[in-house]
């Protein structure tokens, strides 16, 4: 299936040019998306190109500016947030990145009714997290690991927690491992729907071992960065959940929410919190051995001013074939009765589907079914449930939005997006206004991305929000590579792949092949999305064929494929990449002597193991910031898939699956190893150990480090990285510079 045909008519050929590396590094062909900042059923805010904050009313078609770029510029604001009572806006400046999601910033409050900044009782700086209550204009914020509350922006703050301490106790914000591997947010506090209560997590990292690395900076002596970071099998953070009444915060103070007994009996995690009503809350817990999850619904006891979590409102989700959930355990979406909910989990056939839980999980009613997967529940209204899945035409790498009518019986299903712009758009997400009165669809490809606005009742398109016209025009004279998504059937396993082919691809010729791999559990690389990136350039300008393959362990194709890697990381992911390469060779257009593999992070681990597989298939390869031993990586992630590195659990496979154990096998390949020295995620230690093992085995290799760079290798390092990798590959493939 050719998704992006190249234009090769002779008359055009002389005006067309190939992509250059400079195009990629400059972001010349990047696209824009439009996500409305909904403030009601029919209104949204958007930051205009000239930085004004504009309110749009869909029904009147009118818009007006509520905050000028002049006000934004006066405090160098890069972000904003309107209070739900529409009286105030917080302006965020001095953004300072911490980890993947977390950052600190300075916050100013602007009073829209009076056209001036709120003076008196200003916020301290820098703040770790700040948010409005869902109703009115109360403020909760985290400063120096403690939580504060303001009834109104100009009021003095009420301090909720007092035990916050850097790297020891975190209140309202996650520690490193919870941020990266469990919550995937910068915050760990949640307002109740009307702002009566505020729930928050406290993480105690006192006993967690610390990862320490040098940050070289510009000073005479490097700084040492210390992060409490539990590696596989190490001591984990201790989590507690508290709820405080924000109307009378000093009355009884924070009340702890009890942990279900079956969870509290051994090491456990808190995985998410969902408010149902102001007096009902749903907490999800997970055993450290992550195949048992408990969803606990708790109610406020007015008489005792405490939270009660009856055993009858505990719902257990257990996996017998792998870990609980996909990447994370899914979260519930509650219906209007405030007790029943919709949730995605595996059905009896091992496919993730939407279920409706009214009393017990055992009596759950399956809402969707088939040999495909429901991926996200966007919104449940009185009469409709909106979700995304990869059902349409049986392509796992697509995402379409569906509506199920739950108000009628039997419920009817309609695909909202399947036939809108069928060639251009096969991968969607959506954003809904209050009561799903309107919604925005954001299409990511395979054609040029487009964002549109729709009526939530009729699904009619109202207007185009962003169609990337400039990008479309800029690409008119570019020879883009062709892309095709197909599948291989091998030993009862379906291997979906994406192949990126040079513009003048000729099946009778031989081309160098580059495999790009990620391959981590519950990931997906073969997606019908638009991208003009480094591999597009390699195909367009350098004439390489690039392939991405989703093997065992990858997502959205059922539990059999997903859980195949359980407790055996580093085996089948590698096997499946190798199998695919052999199949590609059989296709007849691959030069067997010029095959390379590269990957980043988990992909760096897989590419390293593939190079060291002893197959002789790969001439060369690159590993960027690879994991080299699962004993070096974070507990929450690693143990989910590998269990514990103990003798009576899975230590043997921890030891067998290292890159270092295969050092000898790198002798006959050209290996480029790359890592940032300030990688807080996959520590530089991983590459240091690979390098040590290769040196000890007297195996030659190439390496590049990036001083003071983290797992993302951003900024100028990005340019240097891709330039360096390009030279390496061109040399490997004997391509002239």
């Amino acid at each position: 299936i050719v998704l992006r045909p190249s234009r090769v008519h002779n008359s055009e050929e002389n005006t067309m040019r190939a992509l250059t590396l400079k195009d990629i590094l400059n972001g010349t062909f990047s696209y824009k998306t439009f996500f409305p900042n909904w403030i009601s059923g029919q209104e949204y805010l958007h930051q205009s190109a000239d930085n004004n904050i504009v309110l749009y009313n869909i029904e009147t078609g009118q818009s007006y500016t509520i905050l000028s770029n002049r006000t934004m510029k006066s405090v160098n604001a890069s972000n904003y947030g309107l209070s739900p009572d529409r009286q105030f806006v917080y302006l965020e400046s001095d953004y300072s990145k911490l980890w993947r999601y977390s950052y600190t910033a300075t916050y100013y409050i602007y009073d829209l009714s009076n056209g001036e900044f709120v003076r008196g009782n200003e916020l301290p700086r820098p703040i770790q997290y700040l948010c409005w209550s869902p109703v009115g204009s109360k403020l909760a914020y985290v400063y120096q690991n403690n939580i504060y509350l303001k009834q109104r922006p100009g009021d003095p703050p009420f301090q909720i927690t007092f035990n916050g301490r850097e790297n020891k106790i975190f209140n309202g914000i996650p520690d490193w491992v919870y941020e990266e591997e469990m919550l995937a947010t910068k915050y760990a506090l949640w307002w109740s729907p009307n702002g009566k209560f505020l729930a928050y997590a406290e993480f105690n990292d006192t006993d967690i071992p610390v990862i320490a690395y040098s940050y070289y900076g510009d000073e005479q002596y490097p700084r040492t960065i210390n992060i409490p970071y539990p590696k596989a099998g190490a001591k984990n953070p201790v989590v507690r959940i508290f709820i405080i009444d924000t109307t009378y915060p000093a009355y009884v103070g924070p009340q702890e929410v009890p942990v279900p007994a079956m969870i509290a009996s051994s090491d456990y995690y808190f995985s998410w919190l969902t408010w149902v009503t102001d007096e009902r809350v749903c907490l999800q817990w997970l055993k450290r051995v992550q195949n048992v999850s408990v969803l606990s619904i708790c109610d406020f006891r007015e008489d005792w001013q405490t939270w009660d979590c009856p055993k009858t409102q505990e719902h257990i989700e257990e996996s017998r074939t792998g870990w609980a959930g996909g990447f994370f355990v899914s979260t519930p979406v509650f219906s209007y009765d405030a007790i029943s909910y919709y949730k995605i989990f595996s059905d009896k056939d091992g496919y993730k589907h939407i279920h409706y839980i009214k009393d017990t999980v055992e009596n759950a009613i399956q809402i969707t079914s088939g040999k495909w997967e429901a991926i996200n529940i966007f919104r449940v209204t009185q009469d409709s449930l909106f979700y995304s899945s990869n059902e349409f035409e049986e392509y796992p790498g697509r995402r379409n939005i569906y509506r199920i009518s739950i108000g009628s019986y039997p419920p009817s299903k309609k695909c909202v997006t399947c036939h809108l712009r069928k060639e251009r758009c096969q991968y969607y997400t959506a954003s809904f206004s209050d009561y799903a009165k309107y919604y925005a669809l954001v299409c990511y490809g395979p054609g040029i991305p487009i964002s549109t606005l729709h009526d939530g009742r009729t699904d009619q398109e109202i207007k185009i929000l962003e169609e990337n016209k400039e990008l479309e025009n800029a690409l008119k004279n570019i020879q883009l590579p062709k892309e095709e998504i197909k599948k291989l059937e091998v030993d009862e396993i379906t291997l979906w792949y994406k192949m990126i082919l040079p513009p003048q691809f000729d099946r009778s010729k031989k081309y160098p092949l580059l495999i790009q791999v990620y391959g981590g559990p519950c990931s997906q690389s073969v997606r019908s999305v638009f991208a003009v990136n480094w591999i597009s350039y390699l195909a367009s300008k350098e004439g390489m064929v690039i392939a991405l393959v989703d093997g065992r362990g990858t997502a959205f194709q059922g539990d059999k494929l997903l859980y195949a890697v359980y407790r055996k990381l580093g085996v089948y992911e590698v096997e499946d990449q190798i199998t695919a390469v052999r199949k590609f060779i059989e296709m007849g257009f691959i030069d067997e002597k010029r095959i390379a593999i590269w990957g980043w992070s988990y992909g760096g681990y897989v590419s390293s193991l593939a190079l060291a597989s002893g197959t002789g298939l790969f001439k060369c390869g690159i590993a960027v910031a690879p994991v080299s031993s699962w004993e070096y990586y974070a507990s929450v992630y690693t143990e989910r898939f590998m269990g514990l590195p103990t003798k009576d659990d899975n230590l043997e496979h921890y030891k067998n699956s290292t890159v270092m154990a295969r050092a000898e096998y790198f002798r006959n390949v050209d290996y480029l190893l790359i890592h940032g020295t300030a990688d807080d995620n996959v520590h530089f230690q991983n590459s240091a150990q690979i390098a040590k093992a290769l040196v000890n085995a007297q195996v030659d290799f190439q390496a590049m480090w990036y001083s003071d760079q983290n797992h993302g290798l951003s900024g100028l390092s990005t340019n240097h990285l891709y330039t360096h990798m390009t030279h390496f590959l061109k040399q490997c493939f004997s391509l002239s510079d």
């Epitope: 009601s40 009313n57 009147t60 009118q62 529409r86 829209l112 009714s113």
Partner: nanobody, 117 residues
Framework: QVQLQESGGGLVQTGGSLRLSCAAS????????MGWYRQALGNQRELVAG???????YYPDSVKGRFTISRDNDKNTIYLQMNSLKPEDTAVYYC???????????WGQGTQVTVSS
């Protein structure tokens, strides 16, 4: 010329009631969210009620249960029914877009509400 004309204020005793009206001319007000604001002597202007085009309302705790905002889209008018008035409700009451538009100089003259004890 966009204009907002507030009316209905007056002097009333504690516990009494008043109904304020705001007539809006100009297309910007048609179908947009509107609010009632007040400013007491020496204080900042503050919101007392808001209503969206589809009739969803908001009230701060200080007036919740006592004040009711409504709108008549045909007449381009919004109303504020104020019951159980208290001395602290004494202020000049204004109507405007909710939130207000920037550079929107034409806040109306407002209407004075005085609650005596």
């Amino acid at each position: 010329q966009v204009q907002l004309q507030e009316s209905g204020g007056g002097l009333v005793q504690t516990g009494g009631s008043l109904r304020l009206s705001c007539a809006a001319s100009g297309s910007i007000f048609v179908g947009n969210a509107m609010g009632w604001y007040r400013q007491a002597l020496g204080n900042q202007r503050e919101l007392v009620a808001g209503i969206t085009s589809d009739g969803i309302t908001y009230y701060p705790d200080s007036v919740k249960g006592r004040f009711t905002i409504s709108r008549d889209n045909d007449k381009n008018t919004i109303y504020l029914q104020m019951n159980s008035l208290k001395p602290e409700d004494t202020a000049v009451y204004y109507c405007n877009l909710w939130p207000p538009r920037i550079g929107f100089a034409s806040w109306g003259q407002g209407t004075q509400v005085t609650v005596s004890s």
